[in-house]
Amino acid sequence: APVRSLNCTLRDSQQKSLVMSGPYELKALHLQGQDMEQQVVFSMSFVQGEESNDKIPVALGLKEKNLYLSCVLKDDKPTLQLESVDPKNYPKKKMEKRFVFNKIEINNKLEFESAQFPNWYISTSQAENMPVFLGGTKGGQDITDFTMQFVSS
């Protein structure tokens, strides 16, 4: 079945942008001016997910790349990774659970909770130039709130 998708950028609540750091990692840092063109453009898709009051299940792919954010166990710890997929088959309505994030919107701020690992969130560090990761705490030092901006083609 076809899915509703959009193109967007994400910034954390400290206004750090997300950029590629090597082929399979994202990092967060402050960008200005022309450097803003470095930020990753996501293709966010509305997918099938479990019932929950005001959580909306989405998948986060990298626009025009066959890479999706996914959540897997590594050394017994929930971990965020960029995973290659077959572009002929993605995005799809029934994404595998590791690709699904519950988007939670509160006061124009977005959180992305892993569907595979409840209460684990896409997170950034306070420090500059650090990897985007899956964090198991909210409201602590690490940042779990993001803002979204559509990207004009």
Epitope: A1, V3, S5, L6, N53, E105
Partner: antibody, heavy 119, light 108 residues
Framework: EVQLVESGGGLVQPGGSLRLSCTVS????????MSWVRQAPGKGLEWIGI???????YYASWAKGRFTISKDTSKNTLYLQMNSLRAEDTAVYFC?????????????WGQGTTVTVSS | DIVMTQSPSTLSASVGDRVTITCQAS??????LSWYQQKPGKAPKLLIY???TLASGVPSRFSGSGSGAEFTLTISSLQPDDFATYYC??????????FGQGTKLEIK
């Protein structure tokens, strides 16, 4: 305060074209999706389509081809281009804001602009 | 496309009555259903989203229930301000967003 104001309605001949506008304030079109919905006289609500970014628009099957949704974020304005108009397109046209991305429901509406297709 | 069917089309009731409006989807839409109220000459107003969550500022006499393909809107004790037309809306069943045909709630 969230406000949406439609304009551009009026009388148009069958086969003609019309572009409706919806100017918004109190929020940004760069982070909210917008729909157009219409209501023929004495009839129910009919969803036309929705726009996210300028490359991501989705339409009701009956609207594809004749109706085009676009926006100018810098002007806080949403548009509905309607071509090859027919008598059955006579309706009040509303713009509406999606409450959250992909929520599908609409928490802010304009007052509507009336389009009459008649010779 | 998913088709939304409301019943009844018209409902006559009195102030203080408990009323229920039903909405059926042609296939499962999980809990992706909203309800709107519309008064003559006005824009619709969001009442309930995700089948059962009350929108901001909506009185608690309104409630929604259901999932899958069967949904209901209940007004526990009708007030004079509640006489209007009510619409259900599929908000998540694929690409298309669809409204029911409406239920007109009128004074008996």
């Amino acid at each position: 305060e969230v406000q949406l104001v439609e304009s551009g309605g009026g009388l148009v001949q069958p086969g003609g074209s019309l572009r409706l506008s919806c100017t918004v304030s109190g929020f940004s079109l760069s982070s909210y999706a917008m729909s157009w919905v219409r209501q023929a006289p004495g009839k129910g609500l009919e969803w036309i389509g929705i726009i996210y970014d300028s490359a991501s628009t989705y339409y009701a099957s009956w609207a594809k081809g004749r109706f085009t949704i676009s926006k100018d974020t810098s002007k806080n304005t949403l548009y509905l281009q309607m071509n090859s108009l027919r008598a059955e397109d006579t309706a009040v046209y509303f713009c509406a804001r999606e409450r959250q991305i992909f929520s599908g429901d609409m928490d802010g509406w304009g007052q509507g602009t009336t389009v009459t297709v008649s010779s | 496309d998913i088709v939304m069917t409301q019943s009844p089309s018209t409902l006559s009731a009195s102030v203080g009555d408990r009323v229920t409006i039903t909405c059926q989807a042609s296939q499962s839409i999980s809990s992706y259903l909203s309800w709107y109220q519309q008064k003559p000459g006005k824009a619709p107003k969001l009442l309930i989203y995700r089948a059962s969550t009350l929108a901001s500022g909506v009185p608690s006499r309104f409630s929604g229930s259901g999932s899958g393909a069967e949904f209901t809107l209940t007004i526990s004790s009708l007030q004079p301000d509640d006489f209007a037309t009510y619409y259900c809306q599929n908000t998540g069943g694929g690409i298309n967003i669809a409204f029911g045909q409406g239920t007109k709630l009128e004074i008996k």
